[in-house]
Interface confidence: medium
């Protein structure tokens, strides 16, 4: 495979509801019809897989039913949304793109998006 450039934003702030969205864009050197996108989380020196989806170009991304990720694709861009985030999930989220079909196989790994998650302040009890 040839190296493939993957671009993603450096920093994203999650919403107060624990939702973070970012775009993962890849410069496809081939005419891929089948693409696999994986979101990896790097914390300290540990890298874990957050979610992954395989899709046909022009079709929707399909994550597993219990996945915390959703996404849409448009050309060489994938719009990824990660839900259910809490402060402890703050970290570097890396977009990995693989062009699976047709051969040759291409692999691209982004530099990562630092997602900051701030847990909302609990509402003060109101006395009536």
């Amino acid at each position: 495979c040839k190296a493939m450039h993957v671009a993603q934003p450096a920093v994203v702030l999650a919403s107060s509801r624990g939702i973070a969205s970012f775009v993962c864009e890849y410069a496809s050197p081939g005419k891929a019809t089948e693409v696999r996108v994986t979101v990896l989380r790097q914390a300290d020196s540990q890298v874990t897989e957050v979610c992954a989806a395989t899709y046909m170009m022009g079709n929707e991304l399909t994550f597993l039913d219990d996945s915390i990720c959703t996404g849409t694709s448009s050309g060489n861009q994938v719009n990824l949304t990660i839900q259910g985030l809490r402060a402890m999930d703050t970290g570097l989220y890396i977009c990995k793109v693989e062009l699976m079909y047709p051969p040759p196989y291409y692999l691209g790994i982004g530099n990562g998006t630092q997602i900051y998650v701030i847990d909302p302040e609990p509402c003060p009890d109101s006395d009536f």
Epitope: M100, Y101, P103
Partner: antibody, heavy 115, light 111 residues
């Protein structure tokens, strides 16, 4: 853990066909395709082709085009490679491997072609 | 005859460093396609050792390293151990054959 288990050894006559199976477990089957590679006795590795488990698309090495068929069965998470018109120089160990990157391999299936 | 050429054999004493080259042409390595390396221990299936020229899958010791300087990829094994005795193959895409091609293979012997 991720595992690929292949069918047992086969002995075939010249002109016959052989169908090798590769049962996958430990990962989402449709997320990765299968590469098939063979190795003649005492020789190097030879790429035969690739199949997508996602939609069944195939890409075969020119050498095997018209003689090989690769398929997958999502219901049983199994990949198959059928080679027709066997000749003595098809005697080899046949391997399946996960994905085009071949990050996990089956244990191999010995196919002997002899009259 | 393989499209990618490797030395038939290399050897070294335990603890030494050995390198294996993989030479291709303008339709494969020279065209910029990545090189992957596989290790095949005697009597076993091959195992992915290095992908994308220099990346190591988890579980592969850091004694193994891949590099690609221009059009000359190589695999290095430092701190050679007896369990490294195996055949090593490089792999790249060839755009004229429209197929993946393996190198001829290199047998590593630990003296």
């Amino acid at each position: 853990q991720v595992q690929l288990v292949q069918s047992g050894a086969e002995v075939k006559k010249p002109g016959a066909s052989v169908k090798v199976s590769c049962k996958a477990s430990g990962y989402i089957f449709t997320s990765y395709g299968f590469t098939w590679v063979r190795q003649a006795p005492g020789q190097g590795l030879e790429w035969m082709g690739w199949i997508s488990s996602y939609n069944g698309n195939t890409d075969y090495a020119q050498k095997f085009e018209g003689r090989v068929t690769m398929t997958t069965d999502t219901s049983t998470t199994t990949a198959y490679m059928e080679l027709r018109g066997l000749k003595s120089d098809d005697t080899a160990m046949y391997y399946c491997a996960r994905g085009p990157q071949m990050d996990v391999w089956g244990q191999g299936t010995t196919v002997t072609v002899s009259s | 005859q393989s499209v990618l050429t490797q030395p038939p054999s290399v050897s070294g004493a335990p603890g030494q460093r050995v390198t294996i080259s993989c030479t291709g042409s303008s339709s494969n390595i020279g065209a910029g396609y990545d090189v992957h390396w596989y290790q095949q221990l005697p009597g076993t299936a091959p195992k992915l050792l290095i992908y994308g020229n220099s990346s190591r899958p988890s579980g592969v010791p850091d004694r193994f390293s891949g590099s690609k300087s221009g059009t000359s990829p190589s695999l290095a094994i430092s701190g050679l151990q007896s369990e490294d005795e195996a055949d090593y193959y490089c792999l790249s895409w060839d755009e004229s054959l429209n197929a993946y091609v393996f190198g001829s293979g290199t047998k590593v012997t630990v003296l």
